[in-house]
Interface confidence: low
């Protein structure tokens, strides 16, 4: 999906209002210095591409982020403010669709969410610059 035509201001507002709080809640009990940020992004569409990938694509050691509250909010926000984004989600797997209780948070998932926080901060910062 090409995030170029998203309403970035609206996405920023939703992030600051709600998504950020859920990310921080997920990370509660860990220090920001516990993980090194290895994922970055260069502009707003690129940041959203990386955010979507880290949030919704399962990895071998962290398969369940898509069911978290911050992920559901991210999906709703992208679907609202990125034209046509909803259509790209129609073939999402059953596992992505279902809501299940979170199992024990693995260190790898905490690391991935730490990367997400970094990407979102980068996204906010790029809003201050001319694209």
């Amino acid at each position: 999906y090409d995030f170029t035509n998203c309403d970035f201001q609206k996405i920023e507002a939703d992030y600051l209002r709600t998504i950020s709080k859920d990310l921080i809640t997920y990370m509660s009990g860990t220090k920001s210095t516990d993980f090194n940020n290895t994922v970055s992004c260069s502009n707003r569409p690129h940041c959203l591409t990386e955010i979507q990938s880290l949030t919704f694509n399962p990895t071998p050691r962290c398969a369940s982020l898509a069911k978290e509250m911050f992920a559901r909010k991210t999906k709703a926000t992208l679907a609202l403010w990125c034209p046509g984004y909803s259509e790209t989600q129609i073939n999402a797997t059953q596992a992505m669709k279902k809501r299940r209780k979170r199992k024990v948070t693995t260190n790898k998932c905490l690391e991935q969410v730490s990367q997400l926080l970094g990407l979102w901060r980068r996204f906010i910062r790029t809003l201050l610059k001319k694209q």
Epitope: K10, M69, R72, I90, N91, K98
Partner: antibody
Framework: QMQLVESGGGVVQPGRSLRLSCAAS????????MHWVRQAPGKGLEWVAV????????HYADSVKGRFTITRDNSKNTLNLQMNSLRAEDTAVYYC???????????????WGQGTMVTVSS | SYVLTQPPSVSVAPGQTARITCGGN??????VHWYQQKPGQAPVLVVY???DRPSWIPERFSGSNSGNTATLTISRGEAGDEADYYC???????????FGGGTKLTVL
């Protein structure tokens, strides 16, 4: 307890306007998406419109698009539906319903009002 | 636009199991919600997200969803279960909420 109460229904002539209201109580109104759903006499449920929790997004069924406007006042815990250019086929019981904002874009409707009857007839 | 198809009526003997179906193209990829509506009353949510149940709904009500059919199952049917039942999804391609036509459940 959590409650939604609709008002404003009545009999109106075709082409005229009517404004429905829905008063919410017992829950934090400003954090929920809100919908209008209608049911013509003896017929099934038909979704009408949605408004995002903070009013920044609205969407309408094709059958009412351009004629109906959904609004909300979070300071007063009220939802409104302004219905213009009414037609006979708009005759129905109108329900307001809430949906958890973030579960998906349009989640299940977990609380409904009792409905208000709108009759469009000359 | 997306269409949900329900049988107009289903009958069940007291104590037996009733199954109400909701058909739609690849409905298994969507979250399906079910409502019960008794005459003169507002609808009540009985199953959401295919198979989850609100706290106020008895365990006799359950749901499933795969392929092109979602099913609401009511076990040990009672006279009080007589009502119209509606399935509902969100059609993401049109951003519209869609209801099935409704099924009248009769407990014989």
């Amino acid at each position: 307890q959590m409650q939604l109460v609709e008002s404003g229904g009545g009999v109106v002539q075709p082409g005229r306007s009517l404004r429905l209201s829905c008063a919410a109580s017992g829950f934090t109104f400003r954090t929920y998406g809100m919908h209008w759903v209608r049911q013509a006499p003896g017929k099934g449920l038909e979704w009408v419109a949605v408004i995002w929790y903070d009013g920044t997004y609205t969407h309408y069924a094709d059958s009412v698009k351009g004629r109906f406007t959904i609004t909300r006042d979070n300071s007063k815990n009220t939802l409104n539906l302004q219905m213009n250019s009414l037609r006979a086929e708009d005759t129905a019981v109108y329900y307001c319903a809430r949906s958890p904002q973030w579960e998906s874009i349009f989640e299940a409707f977990d609380i409904w009002g009792q409905g208000t009857m709108v009759t469009v007839s000359s | 636009s997306y269409v949900l198809t329900q049988p107009p009526s289903v009958s069940v003997a007291p104590g037996q199991t009733a199954r109400i179906t909701c058909g739609g193209n690849n409905i298994g990829s969507k979250s399906v919600h079910w409502y019960q509506q008794k005459p003169g009353q507002a609808p009540v949510l009985v199953v959401y997200d295919d198979s989850d149940r609100p706290s106020w709904i008895p365990e006799r009500f359950s749901g499933s969803n795969s392929g092109n059919t979602a099913t609401l199952t009511i076990s040990r049917g009672e006279a009080g279960d007589e009502a119209d039942y509606y399935c509902q999804v969100w059609d993401s391609s049109s951003s519209l909420v869609v209801f099935g036509g409704g099924t009248k459940l009769t407990v014989l």
